[in-house]
């Protein structure tokens, strides 16, 4: 799976999106590395 | 709302260094990657890395790595990339971006700022 | 590094006209990469994200597809802001690459 800082970026965002938001305050992509995933 | 605002223009002499600032502000500046990007007079995109303000740590571009240094200052929101050893062929626009999610989901990017390397 | 060649380089069209950019890329790169449109003396404005999913405010006219190493974007009822020059990113790999750019002008 690509890893880069934008895949994350755009993963997490899609994860927020199906979960409403919500999840932990510091599950942000600067925070989370790709095998958060 | 969502703002990158670069610094000023700089006109540069060959051989010497510059640093451009990038400020941050309408979302938390340490949560999102901050790119950069170069474009010469009528030319296309090229990248230069990405920085990581939650701890500093980056991603370079070969091309650049070695003459381009990406830094970040967390008390005042402001990511900055330093070019030394500056040749003409660095006459540029450079831009910085960042992929925000919280408060909007969207790709933002500074307004350009740029670089003159003439003797 | 991976390349990404757009064609055309050059488009000319009219308002109303349905056009097609492709970008296609050297190495498989799934589906992530991103279009923007740039118009002259601004910065890069960014239309699609995940090769076909249009991020927040951009207008439904323009949408995205492709995966792997072919990627286009089309603009189905272009529109006076329209004209300018849309580029193409991957995000797959570092570095990231992007296009030379499609400049798309008034007929």
């Known amino acids: 799976a690509c890893d880069t800082a934008t895949c994350v970026t755009h993963r997490l965002a899609g994860l927020l999106s199906r979960s409403g938001g919500v999840v932990k305050n510091n599950f942000v992509p600067t925070n989370v590395g790709s095998k958060a995933f | 709302q969502v703002q990158l605002v670069q610094s000023g223009a700089e006109v540069v002499k060959p051989g010497a260094s510059v640093k451009i600032s990038c400020k941050a502000s309408?979302?938390?500046?340490?949560?999102?990657?901050m790119n950069w990007v170069k474009q010469a007079p009528g030319q296309g995109l090229e990248w230069i890395g990405d920085?990581?303000?939650?701890?500093?740590?980056?991603h370079y571009n070969q091309k650049f790595k070695g003459r381009a240094t990406l830094t970040v200052d967390t008390s005042i929101s402001t990511a900055y990339m330093e070019l030394s050893r500056l040749r003409s062929d660095d006459t540029a626009v450079y831009y910085c971006a960042s992929i925000t999610i919280v408060p909007v989901y969207f790709d933002f990017w500074g307004q350009g700022t740029l670089l003159t390397v003439s003797s | 590094d991976i390349q990404l060649t757009q064609s055309p380089s050059f488009l000319s069209a009219s308002v109303g006209d349905r056009v097609t950019i492709t970008c296609k890329a050297s190495?498989?790169?799934?589906?992530?990469v991103a279009w923007y449109r740039q118009k002259p003396g601004k910065a890069p404005k960014a239309l699609i994200y995940?090769?076909?999913y249009r991020y927040s405010g951009v207008p439904s006219r323009f949408s995205g597809s492709g995966s792997g190493t072919e990627f286009t974007l089309t603009i189905s009822s272009l529109q006076p802001e329209d004209f300018a020059t849309y580029i193409c990113q991957q995000y797959n790999y570092y570095p990231y690459t992007f296009g030379q750019g499609t400049k798309l002008e008034i007929k």
């Open positions: 309408g979302y938390t500046f340490t949560d999102y990657y």
């Open positions: 995940s090769a076909s």
């Open positions: 920085v990581n303000p939650n701890n500093g740590g980056t």
């Open positions: 190495q498989n790169v799934g589906p992530n």
